[in-house]
Each structure stands twice: as C-alpha cells, then as structure tokens.
C-alpha cells in the first residue's frame, strides 16, 4: 500500500480551523491479524529524508495522536487529551485519515507528516508516510479562509518508505 497526500500546502489565516488529510492507497489486507497504526507528527523541512524527525504537534507526540484499528475501519483519537490541545485525528472507511487543528496560530506553521504502519501478528511489517505543509498567515496578506494547493500526482503517490 501507499499513502497519498491530496494537498501539499495549506495556507490558513490565524484563528481558523484546518483538516490535514492523507489517504491510504492500494490493496489493504483486511485479515483479522492485520491492523493499521496511523498517526501524525511534525518534522523539519531540512531533513535528508522527509519526515525522519518526529516532533510533537502542540506538545502531543505521535503516540498520543495515534489511531489503531483494522483495515478500513473508522476510528478517532482519544478525545480528552487531543481536544484539550485543539486537535482531533480521525479515519474513515475509505482509507482517508486526517488531523483537525482548531484555532490556528502562527506557531502551528510547519511540515506535518502522517504515518501508517501495517502490523501483522503484532509485528511492524510495512510503514509509509506522507508530508504536507501548513502555513498560517496573519495581517493583510492572510486569506480569509484556508486555501489548499493540490499535490502533483507524482508527489502525492511517490511516498518513501520510512
């Protein structure tokens, strides 16, 4: 399987909410012994390998934000902790998973990474990630709502294994 990022850049005004999205592509094994660990974290632009550095999102680590479930099942993060930080990650039946960030500030700008790990018989078998950038703007140059820029098809599907 692969991970696609429908949008490579999100440009939002301060105070807005945004939902960053990744999509699981390709054949997904739905066997009862296969589960998917999905999560989000921040990283630096300057890494030799994109998303190799795992930094927290609003002080929540990738472990705090993870979803753990089988195949294309729907799931949500533990509400209390994430919502106190204005965050919610979710996954639907169609392979889409997302993180919603509320009340954006300039400090939320940066590179965001989604990570999917396929786990068989309790062992990590396959892991892939996707990257996208969030730019929060303020002042007269800021858009009134979030503006999203699609990834090129090559970018969105040519995701390196972590």
């Amino acid at each position: 399987f692969k991970v696609a990022t429908p949008y490579s850049l999100y440009v939002c005004p301060e105070g807005q909410n945004v939902t960053l999205t990744c999509r699981l592509l390709g054949p997904v094994d739905k066997g009862h012994d296969v589960t998917f660990y999905k999560t989000w974290y921040r990283s630096s632009r300057g890494e030799v390998q994109t998303c190799s550095e795992r930094r927290p999102i609003r002080n929540l680590t990738f472990q705090d934000l993870h979803l753990h479930h089988g195949g294309h099942q729907a799931a949500n993060t533990s509400h209390d902790l994430a919502q106190r930080h204005g965050l919610e990650s979710a996954s639907d039946h169609h392979g889409n998973f997302s993180i919603t960030m509320r009340n954006l500030t300039l400090l939320d700008s940066g590179l965001y990474c989604c990570l999917v790990v396929e786990i068989r018989h309790h062992h990590s078998e396959h892991r892939v990630h996707g990257a996208m950038e969030l730019q929060v703007q303020t002042g007269k140059d800021a858009p009134s709502n979030c503006v999203v820029y699609p990834s090129s098809s090559q970018d969105s599907e040519n995701i390196t294994a972590a």
Epitope: R45, R58, L107
Partner: antibody
C-alpha cells in the same frame, strides 16, 4: 558550517530607501525562515519580520508594515530587506538571522550585521 | 505586543561567582506547555548568539554553566560560575506572538 553574510554599510538621506542583502551558505535556504532584527546605536534588539524563502510568505511587525519589504532569491541563497521612507531613527545595525525548528522557532545563526546610517 | 522586562539592567560579578538575570513577560508565553522564551548573549562588537531556547534548553556548544528556568511569565537565566568571556549584554526574547519582542538587555561586567 552555516553562515550568513550581509552586504556592506550604507549611508542614506532621509526619505530614501535602503536594501540590505543576506547570503546564506552551509544549508538549504528553503529549509527554514529568515528574520530581520535591528539595533539602534547603544540600544536593544528590535524584531522587524520574517520571510519563508520557500514560498515567499512574509510576516512583518505592524510597526514597519508599509515601509519594509522582505524578498528572496533562492537561486543565489540570498534574502533581502528593503526599508523605505528612511528617517534618522532608522539609523541602526540590521541583522538577518536564521531560525531553527525544535519544535518551535528561535534564532540560532545571525549575520554579522549591516550598519545603515540615515543622515542629511 | 508582549513587553519583556529584564532585571537587573546591569550586573558586576567577580569571576567564579554566580549570576542571575530575570525576565518577566507582560503575558504568558506558553503554547500548549512549551515556554517560547529564548536567551541571547551579545558580546562587545559581535552579533547576538543563542544561549537558551524554549526556556531551558541549552544550545549546542554553550557551556553548561548556563541554565534557564521558568514558565508562564517569569524566567531566569543563571550562570553558575561567571568567567571573563561571559561579558556582554544578555537579552531575553519571546516567540509566542508576533511581533517577537526582546527585553531591554542586561549588561554583565567583570569586577
């Protein structure tokens, strides 16, 4: 190693504009933001704004909004700060400074500074 | 704007003795548990250099006699044993809100 080298000192008349350059080496300029900070003679540090060299997005201190313009040329790894309608109070050393993300931002490398003197 | 107030504004210390500088922000500089407070040293005739970031993280290459503490609005920079090379002006700076703002500076001299 990471280095920021700024253009030389300038003397300008009131009402004129000045454009200061900052050339980065030792890293990819698109990897992080660049900030401009100034320091009037014998005074403290004053943040002016920042530019994202990847997209060109800028954020200015409202105090300078309308007078300052930050631009970049990624092909030469150079950022620029232009200040217009100069007045004597703009006499200062102007620094460019790179920021680093971990997991927020701070200024970890500074240029050597460019003295801009505004005098009639 | 967030106003940063440093105390004292000047400090004269005997080599080997400790030194402490305080910085108070006019409002909290916390963001979801991280204190967005930095400390810089500007040695005479030089550009500022980073000492401490996020209130207590010591920058690589900075001697371990420097330490930072505090949260919310009140922060402290400590030098456990002052050395001659520590002379200069120390600035605190917040990056919680734009515009980023600096304290007025604290001048450290050696007795």
């Amino acid at each position: 190693q990471v280095q920021l080298v700024q253009s030389g000192a300038e003397v300008k008349k009131p009402g004129a504009s000045v454009k200061v350059s900052c050339k980065a080496s030792g890293y990819n300029i698109k990897d992080t933001y660049m900030h401009w900070v100034r320091q009037a003679p014998g005074q403290g540090l004053e943040w002016m704004g920042r530019i994202d060299p990847t997209h060109g997005y800028v954020i200015y201190d409202p105090k300078f909004q309308g007078r300052v313009t930050m631009t970049r040329d990624t092909s030469t790894s150079t950022v620029y700060m232009e200040l217009s309608s100069l007045r004597s109070e703009d006499t200062a050393v102007y620094y460019c400074a790179r920021d680093r993300f971990d997991p927020y931002w701070f200024l970890d490398v500074w240029g050597q500074g460019t003295l801009v003197t505004v005098s009639s | 704007d967030i106003v940063m107030t440093q105390t004292p504004l000047s400090l004269s210390v005997t080599p080997g003795q400790p030194a402490s500088i305080s910085c108070r922000a006019s409002e909290s500089v916390e963001y979801y548990g991280t204190s967005l407070m930095q400390w810089y040293l500007q040695k005479p005739g030089q550009s500022p250099q980073l000492l401490i970031y996020d209130a207590f993280n010591v920058e690589s290459g900075v001697p371990d006699r420097f330490s930072g503490s505090g949260s919310g609005t009140d922060f402290t920079l400590k030098i456990s044993r002052v050395e001659a090379e520590d002379v200069g002006v120390y600035y605190c700076q917040q990056s919680r809100k734009v515009p980023w703002t600096f304290g007025q500076g604290t001048k450290l001299e050696i007795k």
